[in-house]
């Protein structure tokens, strides 16, 4: 049987001779050289050589446990004469024995980590890990201990775990943001003679909201013309916040001041500025200066930092309203005036009033826009705005006159405004009624008395308030002995009636009836119109068959009292 134990070999042998491993020996070996030892397997003949006579094994090269900790070889013992094995082939192990020849190596050359600023002492930052290739099962060659070489007093490292923690209270990002920490990993449990490796940990403090917004100045002043429409931006203010990102976001608001209702503040999300805008129409004449208290605040606040004070700041904004010269303003948007048509020249119709709305109350002068009164029918007193006639009027020609009056600042003629004037001409009874049309009628020779042969209508250019009331009668010169009568219907119409039975066209073929038409207004106006009545031959139905074809007279009405 074979006689050996497991072989152990120290790694990293540095001697000048081959390193002795051990001896293969069979109890069949009598020491007479009859046996031959043969080695095969891992590294046989190369790494490991055997003296075939003695069975001594040697290592020819320096071995590294971390490269290969175990070699499995096979041993044979052969009778030289017969060539037959004297022992069964057997497997054996050469175990490489560890020495501390490897330093700990970190998993990363450089670690990056973040931790919120102002964290409590002992807050976890990052865990670093170093590995040691030496044998962890034997001795302390692979027992790693962590320590901090650079980064105190800000950070600490747990020696066994490599966990890095904060070590200083109130680390402020706004004071210092970046830290470079150097961590050492040392084997041999950190004892003298242990091997070590280092890594760099770049730690960035992340922002927390520990700073309030601050206005760089306590007072701001802006100017804006009184004509600025609502929504007009008039100035920008900006508070600064030492924090970043969401923690530096600022909201602006107006918290106090006389301008609370007149102005707004809008937060510009891009620039983080507060834009002061006009909210309501301004008026220099009402108020010239406004003060506002504007507040800048963080919308997101961390309650644990409230002890540092309120996360807001305020500034005074003074807004100066600039005067804009405004045109005069009329007391009405339009004026409606009335005047009788019989008014004499220079009759005053009414007046207009305009005033400079500016605080200076500049005087104004008045004029008529002649493009609206080409015939110069009206005029205006440039000083007091009185409107008067400069020509005679006629309602029947034009009922309404639409003119424009201009008010101009005397000190600044560029500032002017206009107003429409609607002048109504009131009716006066200055026109007589007339026949509505030219009346030519006929009567049958065989007509009976009191027959209606024509209804008369009248018109009057006037427009009396109570309506027209016309009366009709035969002219006095024709009233006695007339062959016809006029019947006033009392409804502004009249009828011509026959007064006798039968007419002879050979005796009188045409009658001219002068009719007087009067109105009922003051002063009474009347006119005389003539109605032509022709005598005609008629059939038994009363249909006209023939009349004398005389030239007809178209008489003009005679007017009296005009």
């Amino acid at each position: 049987s074979w006689m050996w134990n497991q072989f152990f070999l120290l790694e990293e042998y540095t001697g000048s001779d081959y390193q002795y491993v051990g001896k293969l020996h069979s109890d069949q070996d009598r020491g007479d050289g009859s046996l031959k030892y043969i080695l095969s397997g891992d590294g046989a003949g190369d790494l490991f050589i055997i003296n075939e006579n003695t069975g001594d094994i040697q290592a020819t090269k320096r071995l590294d446990r971390e490269e290969k900790p175990v070699y499995i070889l096979r041993a044979q013992a052969i009778n030289r004469r017969t060539g037959r094995p004297v022992e069964p082939e057997s497997e054996f192990i050469i175990k490489i024995h560890d020495i501390n020849d490897n330093e700990p190596i970190f998993t990363k050359e450089v670690y990056t980590a973040t931790v919120p600023e102002m964290s409590d002492v002992g807050t976890f930052v990052v865990q670093v890990t170093a590995t040691d290739a030496d044998d962890p099962t034997y001795g302390n060659s692979a027992k790693v201990v962590y320590s901090i070489l650079q980064g105190q007093p800000y950070f600490s490292v747990e020696s066994e775990t490599g966990i890095i923690k904060t070590a200083l209270l109130n680390m402020d990002r706004e004071n210092r943001e970046q830290y470079q920490v150097v961590i050492q990993a040392k084997d041999m449990g950190g004892q003298m003679g242990g091997l070590s490796g280092t890594t760099t940990v770049n730690i960035t403090l992340t922002d927390v909201n520990d700073n309030p917004p601050r206005f760089p100045q306590s007072t701001y002043q802006f100017k804006t013309p009184e004509s600025s429409p609502p929504g007009t931006p008039i100035g920008r203010i900006k508070a600064s916040d030492a924090d970043v990102g969401e923690n530096a976001e600022i909201e602006y608001s107006i918290t106090d001041g006389e301008g609370l209702d007149m102005f707004d503040v809008i937060t510009d999300q891009e620039t983080q500025e507060g834009i002061i805008t006009v909210k309501k129409l301004l008026d220099f004449e009402k108020k010239k200066v406004y003060t506002l208290k504007v507040e800048a605040s963080n919308p997101y606040v961390e309650p644990r930092f409230l002890y540092l004070g309120p996360f807001k700041d305020s500034a005074t904004v003074r807004i100066v309203v600039e005067d804009v010269d405004e045109p005069p303003v009329f007391s009405k948007l339009a004026y409606i005036l009335q005047i009788r048509e019989d008014a004499q020249i220079n009759t005053t119709i009414g007046s207009v009033t305009a005033q400079d709305p500016d605080a200076a109350r500049n005087p104004v002068k008045y004029s008529v826009d002649r493009h609206t009164d080409m015939d110069r029918i009206f005029n205006i007193d440039s000083g007091n705005g009185s409107i008067f006639t400069s020509k005679l009027l006629d309602r029947e020609t034009l009922l309404w006159h639409n003119i424009t009056v201009i008010a101009t600042e005397i000190n600044n003629p560029k500032q002017s405004s206009r107003v429409p004037l609607y002048i109504k001409v009131l009716d006066v009874n200055d026109n007589a009624p007339e026949f509505a049309e030219f009346y030519e009628t006929f009567v049958c020779e065989k007509a009976k008395a009191d027959q209606l042969i024509q209804t008369l209508h009248a018109v009057d250019k006037d427009d009396p308030y109570s309506g027209h009331q016309f009366s009709f009668s035969l002219a006095p010169e024709a009233a006695s002995g007339s062959n016809f009568t006029i019947q006033d219907n009392k409804d502004n119409t009249a009828g011509i009636l026959t007064r006798k039975n039968g007419y002879n066209r050979h005796e009188m073929s045409t009658y001219l009836l002068p009719v007087v038409i009067s109105d009922n207004d003051y002063p009474v106006q009347s006119s005389t119109g003539t109605v032509t009545v022709r005598v005609c031959a008629c059939d038994h139905h009363g249909n006209m068959q023939s009349c004398h074809a005389e030239a007809l007279i178209h008489p003009t009405g005679l007017s009296t009292g005009a």
Epitope: S218, T219, K223, E285, R318, E322, V324, A359, A360
Partner: antibody, heavy 122, light 106 residues
Framework: EVQLVQSGAEVKKPGASVKVSCKAS????????MHWVRQAPGQGLEWMGW????????EYASKFQGRVTITADTSTSTAYMELSSLRSEDTAVYYC???????????????WGQGTLVTVSS | DIQMTQSPSSLSASVGDRVTITCKAS??????LAWYQQKPGKAPKLLIY???TLQTGVPSRFSGSGSGSDFTLTISSLQPEDFATYFC????????FGQGTKVEIK
């Protein structure tokens, strides 16, 4: 030429009131802001308030609020400054000064009155 | 409120000297600053406005500079009539004067 002529010196007892006048000429009185500034003996200048004579609007320094009243009479182009509840520390020369801008409450003072000495003494 | 600080409070100089007076505002007032000259028993007189614009009729030896919160009045060559007290005034927001600088004969 613009001129601001102030009323003469006054001696007042503590607790009394004083009214100083300032007559303007050489410009449109209603179109410029009129300011009042005082100067205690050997001291600096102190702004008190303004009036816009065009419509009588005023603004006062917070220090004088409730104690000062500035008025204007446009018919005589005269501004007035009345200070009440006088105390010894109100002894000063009181100046009226024209604001350079007509159309806005701001700016420097381009013309000054000659000053009125008000002495407050018991 | 904005405070104005003038320095020096007084200085002694001779005719022909170059004199510099400074004025510091407690906050940014841009160029809204005027300089006035006051002689004993007289009203202040406007010299410079908008920090560096010379008022009509004021000699060119007076000049102003600055913007923001730091301003300077310079008299390039002091004349006998220039011995007086000088005030700065801000009109950016409301009105406030410096305490004055008295320029005396050396």
């Amino acid at each position: 030429e613009v001129q601001l002529v102030q009323s003469g010196a006054e001696v007042k007892k503590p607790g009394a009131s004083v009214k100083v006048s300032c007559k303007a000429s050489g410009y449109t009185f209603t179109r410029n802001f009129m300011h009042w500034v005082r100067q205690a003996p050997g001291q600096g200048l102190e702004w008190m308030g303004w009036i816009y004579p065009g419509d009588g609007e005023t603004e006062y320094a917070s220090k004088f609020q409730g104690r000062v009243t500035i008025t204007a009479d446009t018919s005589t182009s005269t501004a007035y400054m009345e200070l009440s509840s006088l105390r010894s520390e109100d002894t000063a020369v009181y100046y009226c000064a024209r604001g350079v801008y007509g159309g806005a409450a701001g700016g420097y003072f381009d013309f000054w009155g000659q000053g009125t000495l008000v002495t407050v003494s018991s | 409120d904005i405070q104005m600080t003038q320095s020096p409070s007084s200085l002694s100089a001779s005719v022909g000297d170059r004199v510099t007076i400074t004025c510091k505002a407690s906050q940014n007032i841009y160029k809204n600053l005027a300089w006035y000259q006051q002689k004993p028993g007289k009203a202040p007189k406007l010299l410079i406005y908008d920090a560096n614009t010379l008022q009509t009729g004021v000699p060119s030896r007076f000049s102003g500079s600055g913007s923001g919160s730091d301003f300077t009045l310079t008299i390039s060559s002091l004349q006998p009539e220039d011995f007086a007290t000088y005030f700065c005034q801000q009109y950016y927001s409301g009105w406030a004067f410096g305490q004055g600088t008295k320029v005396e004969i050396k």
